[in-house]
């Protein structure tokens, strides 16, 4: 058993049929010695008396808010949460496996630039009685500071018969140099509590590996005389690291109709303009990627050909 | 500790081309190592990230773009002095700081070159003959060093009398390639910045 935060404790349980469970001793936070009774949650049933209460925690019915009282007055609370371990593996029931980039990916993180700011998000089908707490650091043995905000519900989607909820959090490395060469990864730890179930999820990455630039901005078209060709130009996104001659991007320019199956024109360039063939009812799209370290491509920025 | 704005004219910067070749060569070699050594811990997640140039050179700090010198987090640098007579310095206006940057890059390349050559000698003794260093990568390191053209004492190639542990050597190769790729990215960024300034 360990303390998650003040008056909240996590009991780690091997979860299998007829498991013996864990013996837990609760101590009432009071100078009083006599006349103390214990109850669980809203029940008025007295579970025991005395300054300490010893319980055998085997299942969720044994978890919850234990309260010690004296003469009708509440002295203190202890909330017990369960963390299940099945076949030596901690449960991952609360969050959905996003399966990208690989199986057992529960947390996904992205950074728009090298400033040390990044966003992580996760998915769940649970809508109520759910809380998250996020911590992060650079390295684990001698951790350097990363400050994370509160996790917030950022999107709701309908998937078949189910509703899916996306939560996200923004974090910022306390002293980040955009030009630095990372040797220690960022560690992100998410504590998830659903009702009386506790789970924790972690992700470890280098900022350079989670870079995904914003789409290029200010796309403009200029038809070329006596030609089917169009010159398309754009600018670096505002959120990209500067100077741009140091943090350079490369671009993919594509002309395609509404359907992915339609024919297309495609060209890659390090410049902020390109010449392509425009077709009626097609769009010109441009996306960006770090020129020297191939992490993710940005989303497309698009303009219609006409 | 930072790059000046007054740097060579665009067409006069021979090192840009060589640094692009370097990044390409090390990336290809790393990809080859990951594929060939698929049953060894050779991915970014599996290896320890070590920098053989740590406390010996200060490339990131010495080559910091002017715009980042206002960022306090970028300025916790180690002071290092280098000889300054490189041929990539195509302009007399080139400052001492730029020379410091380029000589730091030269020292990095020299250190990695020695490590890679020592390692290749060991890998050539492996009865499995599983992986060797790409000669193209070694040639590209050499070309960039020649383009930088700094005078510096030659570092003797490390020779080891004991029987090499090939498993350890291959893991060290992965560590070295990962670190060198990251340094090659920095070098490419620096050359691009200098070329554009």
């Amino acid at each position: 058993i360990w303390e998650l935060k003040k008056d909240v404790y996590v009991v780690e349980l091997d979860w299998y049929p007829d498991a013996p469970g864990e013996m837990v001793v609760l101590t009432c936070d009071t100078p009083e010695e006599d006349g103390i009774t214990w109850t669980l949650d809203q029940s008025s049933e007295v579970l025991g008396s005395g300054k300490t209460l010893t319980i055998q925690v085997k299942e969720f019915g044994d978890a919850g808010q234990y309260t010690c009282h004296k003469g009708g007055e509440v002295l203190s609370h202890s909330l017990l949460l369960l963390h299940k371990k099945e076949d030596g593996i901690w449960s991952t029931d609360i969050l959905k496996d996003q399966k990208e980039p690989k199986n057992k990916t529960f947390l996904r993180c992205e950074a728009k630039n090298y400033s040390g700011r990044f966003t992580c998000w996760w998915l769940t089908t649970i809508s109520t009685d759910l809380t998250f707490s996020v911590k992060s650091s650079r390295g684990s043995s001698d951790p350097q500071g990363v400050t994370c905000g509160a996790a917030t519900l950022s999107a709701e989607r309908v998937r078949g018969d189910n509703k899916e909820y996306e939560y996200s959090v923004e974090c910022q490395e306390d002293s980040a140099c955009p030009a630095a060469e990372e040797s220690l990864p960022i560690e992100v730890m998410v504590d998830a509590v659903h009702k009386l179930k506790y789970e924790n999820y972690t992700s470890s990455f280098f900022i350079r590996d989670i870079i995904k630039p914003d789409p290029p901005k200010n796309l403009q078209l200029k038809p070329l005389k006596n030609s089917r060709q169009v010159e398309v130009s754009w600018e670096y996104p505002d959120t990209w690291s500067t100077p741009h001659s140091y943090f350079s991007l490369t671009f993919c320019v594509q002309v395609q109709g509404k359907s992915k199956r339609e024919k297309k024109d495609r060209v890659f360039t390090d410049k902020t303009s390109a010449t392509v063939i425009c077709r009626k009812n097609a769009s010109i799209s441009v996306r960006a990627q770090d020129r020297y370290y191939s992490s993710s491509w940005s989303e497309w920025a698009s303009v219609p050909c006409s | 500790r930072n790059l000046p704005v007054a740097t060579p004219d665009p067409g006069m910067f021979p090192c840009l081309h060589h640094s692009q070749n370097l990044l390409r060569a090390v990336s290809n070699m790393l990809q080859k190592a990951r594929q060939t050594l698929e049953f060894y811990p050779c991915t970014s997640e599996e290896i320890d990230h070590e920098d053989i140039t740590k406390d010996k050179t200060s490339t990131v700090e010495a080559c910091l773009p002017l715009e980042l010198t206002k960022n306090e987090s970028c300025l916790n640098s180690r002071e290092t002095s280098f000889i300054t007579n490189g041929s990539c310095l195509a302009s007399r206006k080139t400052s001492f700081m730029m020379a410091l940057c380029l000589s730091s890059i030269y020292e990095d390349l020299k250190m990695y070159q020695v490590e890679f050559k020592t390692m290749n000698a060991k890998l050539l003794m492996d009865p499995k003959r599983q992986i060797f260093l790409d000669q193209n990568m070694l040639a590209v390191i050499d070309e960039l060093m020649q383009a930088l053209n700094f005078n510096s004492e030659t570092v003797p190639q490390k020779s080891s009398l004991e029987e090499p542990d090939f498993y350890k050597t291959k893991i060290k190769l992965c560590i070295l390639l990962h670190a060198f790729r990251i340094r090659a990215v920095t070098i490419d960024r620096v050359m691009s910045y200098l070329n554009a300034s």
Partner: antibody, heavy 118, light 107 residues
Framework: QVQLVQSGAEVKKPGASVKVSCKAS????????LHWVRQAPGRGLEWMGW????????EYAPKFQGRVTMTTDTSTSTAYMELRSLRSDDTAVYYC???????????WGQGTMVTVSS | EIVMTQSPATLSVSPGERATLSCRAS??????LHWYQQKPGQAPRLLIY???QSISGIPARFSGSGSGTEFTLTISSLQSEDFAVYYC?????????FGGGTKVEIK
């Protein structure tokens, strides 16, 4: 499967014209760009131009501008390349090639040998 | 127009050996570079597109790399059916242009 079948070999006199055909099958004809590439005996490949069968748009290499015409007949899924004012150095194998992507060639015809000789 | 130069013109390699073919562009073409194989009496066949992207059905021994002005096609272990002429082609700008080809012959 996607296939391009070209017309047979031709022998032409200098100054004449030649029209080579390329019949497509195994895909919707208007879904692919169509290019013409030639190869002189013992020489490399030379791109001549492209046509979009969907709308008849064309782009020709400057070298052939004014001397080449590329057309398509969507009813028969056939593309045509006509080269005028033939010279002896136009002797080559002429290939049609197609792709959903404009700038490279995924599927090739078997080639048509055009000999220009007096 | 962009001029593509391939080297060497002829490459003599023993079966099972590695072959490295080079292609250089007269100006930077990013990764707009494609590789083809042509056997005598046959049409060319696309091997690699956009410098390094592999094509389904093409053996994994064929790989491409490079960007900017310098590109490489590598055949990791030559098989008898790989002896042919190889062409690179740029798609950075029109007119599309090919290299002069590299003939890979049996040593």
């Amino acid at each position: 499967q996607v296939q391009l079948v070209q017309s047979g070999a031709e022998v032409k006199k200098p100054g004449a014209s030649v029209k080579v055909s390329c019949k497509a099958s195994g895909y919707t004809f208007t879904d692919y760009y169509l290019h013409w590439v030639r190869q002189a005996p013992g020489r490399g490949l030379e791109w001549m131009g492209w046509i979009d069968p969907e709308n008849g748009d064309t782009e020709y290499a400057p070298k052939f501008q004014g001397r080449v015409t590329m057309t398509t007949d969507t009813s028969t899924s056939t593309a045509y390349m006509e080269l005028r004012s033939l010279r002896s150095d136009d002797t080559a194998v002429y290939y049609c090639a197609a792709n959903k992507e404009l700038r490279y060639f995924d599927v090739w015809g078997q080639g048509t040998m055009v000999t220009v000789s007096s | 127009e962009i001029v593509m130069t391939q080297s060497p013109a002829t490459l003599s390699v023993s079966p099972g050996e590695r072959a490295t073919l080079s292609c250089r562009a007269s100006q930077s073409i990013s990764i707009n570079l494609h590789w083809y194989q042509q056997k005598p009496g046959q049409a060319p066949r696309l091997l690699i597109y956009f410098a390094s992207q592999s094509i389904s059905g093409i053996p994994a021994r064929f790989s491409g790399s490079g960007s900017g002005t310098e590109f490489t096609l590598t055949i990791s272990s030559l098989q008898s059916e790989d002896f042919a002429v190889y062409y690179c082609q740029q798609s950075n700008s029109f007119p599309l242009t090919f290299g002069g080809g590299t003939k890979v012959e049996i040593k």
